[in-house]
């Protein structure tokens, strides 16, 4: 829907295992074994979750920020934590999930104060590799469908990712949303660095698949901030 349409991930109500309990992406980390841990794009148990150490937000996935896992904890030990949903407490923009920013200590929608239909969008960066087609999938065209799927197939009309079949997410293509494939390891993903930048895409990529998160490609670490390539990588 519209708020999430403008987010790069455009993910609502993810079906497990790609998403956790709806409405709780910012749950606190628990040290108890077997408790659900909201890491990256997948809820995992503490037993098999490997916290990703970080020094800055840019090193974390699209839906994460870099912070100490315990309140008032050792500032030297920081890991990637799940972003905070709208109306949750925050201290800086990066803590808020895509499409939101930190205002007066609360995550609020980035697009509350302007008409979201204005043509102010910029086309998502496109890279010269075989994963960089604007919509991220092949060009086959089927103009008629008599199949009545409960879950939408690739290219189907959707409002949220739960409308799409397994392995697909609901993401924006121009001014509407369709089911697109979840990104695989090595595929280019979108990492947002600017406040409000989540709303600037007319071709949204899906999020990275299970066990992957969107991180700077190792050989691009030396590149300038603006051109660093992000790809889906194993945790």
């Amino acid at each position: 829907t519209l708020n999430s349409v403008l987010n790069s991930n455009a993910i609502k109500n993810l079906p497990p295992p790609l998403g956790g309990a709806a409405g709780h992406p910012g749950s606190a980390v628990s040290a108890a074994p077997g408790i659900l841990y909201p890491g990256g794009n997948k809820y995992q148990t503490i037993d098999n979750y490997q916290p990703y150490p970080c020094a800055e937000d840019e090193e974390c996935g699209t839906d994460e920020y870099c912070a100490s896992p315990t309140r008032g904890g050792d500032a030297g030990v920081q890991i990637c934590l799940a972003c905070r949903k709208r109306r949750k407490r925050c201290m800086r923009h990066a803590m808020c999930c895509p499409g939101n920013y930190c205002k007066n200590g609360i995550c609020v929608s980035s697009d509350q104060n302007h008409f979201r239909g204005e043509i102010e969008e910029t086309i998502t960066e496109s890279f010269g590799n075989d994963h960089s087609t604007l919509d991220g999938y092949s060009r086959r065209t089927t103009l008629s469908s008599k199949m009545y799927h409960t879950k939408g197939q690739e290219g189907s009309v959707c409002l949220r990712s739960s409308d799409c079949a397994s392995g697909l997410c609901c993401a924006r293509h121009f001014w509407s949303k369709i089911c697109k494939p979840v990104l695989k390891e090595g595929q280019v993903c979108t990492k947002h660095r600017r406040k409000g930048s989540h709303g600037l895409e007319i071709f949204q990529r899906c999020y990275c698949g299970e066990g992957l998160s969107c991180r700077i490609q190792k050989d691009h670490h030396q590149a300038s901030n603006s051109s660093r390539l992000h790809t889906c990588q194993r945790h």
Partner: antibody, heavy 117, light 107 residues
């Protein structure tokens, strides 16, 4: 400016099919999903389904149980809605409506389909 | 499917009155609510889109509020041209669903 022009009124017998067209202009047809909404006389609005012209992907309201088929012809920027096995309670005005970020912002003028024996 | 309960089903008010129409959804839809006005014999017109956003060209006397399950369309000062049926539409989850409509008349 954006315009959606629909085909004219139709009178059909129960059990027949009807195909309504919606010709779009004033914007790039493949960039927006096209929805179909119907309104029975004196009644409210009911979403039937939508089609995204980019790949022809569709989504339907399950209420219509396979009776509705949405198609597009990209070369003429035209969307079509075919409703089969018509019943008397399918008598309604059928609208096409352009999707804009989740809302339906521009609507066709409507096509009255009357089902009568 | 998400059910939308719109109230009142009809109302009569005087020019200049403040009018409110409510729409309650069967599940939390965040702020994914849209409001339409349909004048007699005319096509529905989008007034307010998701996030309580006033559409371009729509008079500022119209406003939308609410999130979660409770939503309100307010007309701050009723005008004669506002005689119409008003519909809410949720765009949070397929299938799209509309409220049953509120018929607004001038006293």
């Amino acid at each position: 400016q954006v315009q959606l022009v629909q085909s004219g009124a139709e009178v059909k017998k129960p059990g027949a099919s009807v195909k309504v067209s919606c010709k779009a202009s004033g914007y790039t047809f493949t960039e927006n999903t096209m929805h179909w909404v119907r309104q029975a006389p004196g009644q409210g609005l009911e979403w039937m389904g939508g089609i995204n012209p980019h790949k022809g992907g569709t989504s339907y309201n399950q209420k219509f149980k396979g009776r509705v088929t949405l198609t597009v012809d990209k070369s003429s920027s035209t969307a079509y809605m075919e409703l089969s096995r018509l019943r008397s309670d399918d008598t309604a005005v059928y609208y096409c409506a352009r999707d804009w970020l989740g809302a339906m912002d521009y609507w066709g003028q409507g096509t009255l389909v009357t089902v009568s024996s | 499917d998400i059910q939308l309960t719109q109230s009142p089903s009809s109302l009569s008010a005087s020019v200049g009155d403040r009018v409110t129409i409510t729409c309650i959804t069967s599940t939390d839809i965040d702020d994914d609510m849209n409001w339409y006005r349909q004048k007699p014999g005319k096509v529905p017109k989008l007034l307010i889109s998701e996030g309580n956003t006033l559409r371009p060209g729509v008079p500022s006397r119209f406003s939308g509020s609410g999130s979660g399950t409770d939503f309100t369309l307010t007309i701050s000062s009723l005008q004669p041209e506002d005689v119409a049926t008003y519909y809410c539409l949720q765009s949070d989850n397929l299938p799209y669903t509309f409220g049953q409509g509120t018929k607004l008349e001038i006293k």
